[in-house]
Interface confidence: low
Amino acid sequence: KIDACKRGDVTVKPSHVILLGSTVNITCSLKPRQGCFHYSRRNKLILYKFDRRINFHHGHSLNSQVTGLPLGTTLFVCKLACINSDEIQICGAEIFVGVAPEQPQNLSCIQKGEQGTVACTWERGRDTHLYTEYTLQLSGPKNLTWQKQCKDIYCDYLDFGINLTPESPESNFTAKVTAVNSLGSSSSLPSTFTFLDIVRPLPPWDIRIKFQKASVSRCTLYWRDEGLVLLNRLRYRPSNSRLWNMVNVTKAKGRHDLLDLKPFTEYEFQISSKLHLYKGSWSDWSESLRAQTPEEEPTGMLDVWYMKRHIDYSRQQISLFWKNLSVSEARGKILHYQVTLQELTGGKAMTQNITGHTSWTTVIPRTGNWAVAVSAANSKGSSLPTRINIMNLCEAGLLAPRQVSANSEGMDNILVTWQPPRKDPSAVQEYVVEWRELHPGGDTQVPLNWLRSRPYNVSALISENIKSYICYEIRVYALSGDQGGCSSILGNSKHKAPLSGPHINAITEEKGSILISWNSIPVQEQMGCLLHYRIYWKERDSNSQPQLCEIPYRVSQNSHPINSLQPRVTYVLWMTALTAAGESSHGNEREFCLQGKAN
């Protein structure tokens, strides 16, 4: 920073403010009796540009011509150097280098709303590096003029604070902006416009929607607008969509009927306004209105499947399952499902409403011909019922699909393939692929999954509710009229060796052989579909290799006889389980000594 210049002066010619590329003359002169004390002719005046020496001279004054100064501020300081003393600061000056303002470009003016004020924006062009004042001038009919000045170095916006009125909407107004700094001035090209050109209406407000007789087909959107609005554009979309539907309307007077809304769908609505067909600009979009359309009765039909289970000689259990309708089919909140069970020969029927579930189980006699019908109901009505005749789905052996296989297909997918049945393959009307987690107890509460496949398909990719390291019982049904045939297989999407072996819970002796019983491995430790069990045994305290017996895995089996043990020899026994990926660790060890007579 610069001191008070008591010892001398620094003068700058032609000015402290110069055009980029100009030359300045800087003169440093000592005031009388301010030189070196004894030897005034030894005065050494030094000129610094910031902290760097650029010139020096012996005497009472120093003159320096400086060129090539950069944009911005440069500080020059003059110092006096005397023999045997520090340099003394004499005086200094700051020189400001800039450019004249460029012509402001793209001047445009807007009035927001009929009651708003006129504001203009422009592009300043390159920075002048000097304080630059902008003056905006607006001239109108009857020699009216308004002027506003901007007091900001980065000024590119000014609001006149005046309101143009629509009394004479075709009257011309002209705006011009002038930039001035100490190096020059420049004016924009004039911008001429009318009231209709620059008034941008306020966005519509108070948007409402009405559904006459609670019907989606009789829907009217209402809103409020400024008085002079001629055009509106409406846009609307389901809340979960990114694409807008767009409608342009003329002279809507704050209402418009919408004819293509979907039932039971939350929509977002917005409206924009304009004063003239081809003059002016659209308003901003209004705030969104979100509204849900009314329900309509469901369309489509439920996908229904069933399972039959034998109970005893006179009764059977029927479990019905169905899939939810899609949102576009449900067209509302499904309140209940209506299940009708009918004995076709006797005409007996029972109807039940099911809420909160997509399955239903009942017990019926094994005699008679039974059919079910299932429909979905919302507040407006019911879907068409899906009707199914209850039959023995696996009764027709000749309809059984052949060579069924199940192979892992990427993450959590299983590809099921089959060959058509031997019986005339053209008789097949559809295939159903069904899968459920394999539970050793044959648990009927395990969720059932299914998909339908066209009669010419011989494969299906199942991915719904498939988890890694879980074994699934997969069935392929071929359906033809009132007959069905089926084949089954076990499959998994991903497998590894089981985490544990079976737990031997009992060893019993029967006529010179033993029967080993075990507990199933918990499902979460099987790690896929089991292929075999192995039973190992060896004499206690023996170092010999154990003998083993490999048993193919069957869901229901949990015991097996061994008849090659010697009497009165103590054996150690254990079991393992195998998947296609490998063998488990040992289960528990049990000792046993056969009591029977030696040969």
Partner: nanobody
Framework: EVQLVESRGGLVQPGGSLRLSCAVS????????IAWFRQTPGHEREGVSS????????YYADSVKGRFSISRDNAKNMVYLQMNSLKPEDTAVYTC??????????????????WGQGTQVTVSS
């Protein structure tokens, strides 16, 4: 060395008056502008008023027009801000700032290289 030193502010009742002064030293030419800025917590500095040393031309922000008056005493190198009809919303830290220039303007704070230390003005009953 350019230096700016403000007088102390104070506590004033709504409707009351207060005069702030700014002692200016160190400029080497008359090409300079002195401006008063104010700032409240959480807000940007706002240009209140400014005056040019050479010809005494003045500028006022819309929020203080008709209530505040800026003046200079060239002999004493002082600039004064007379604040009348004070309102609670005038409560702020007031600081004088300076820059070399040829045209007057409220300007943005970043245009001013030289600043005083600031003084608190509180308008409250």
């Amino acid at each position: 060395e350019v230096q700016l030193v403000e007088s102390r502010g104070g506590l004033v009742q709504p409707g009351g008056s207060l005069r702030l002064s700014c002692a200016v030293s160190g400029f080497t030419s008359d090409y300079y502008v002195i401006a008063w800025f104010r700032q409240t917590p959480g807000h940007e500095r706002e240009g209140v008023s400014s005056i040019r040393k050479g010809d005494g031309a003045t500028y006022y922000a819309d929020s203080v027009k008709g209530r505040f008056s800026i003046s200079r005493d060239n002999a004493k190198n002082m600039v004064y801000l007379q604040m009348n009809s004070l309102k609670p919303e005038d409560t702020a830290v007031y600081t004088c700032a300076a820059r070399y220039d040829t045209l007057l303007g409220g300007g943005r704070p970043r245009e001013f290289p030289y600043w005083g230390q600031g003084t608190q003005v509180t308008v409250s009953s």
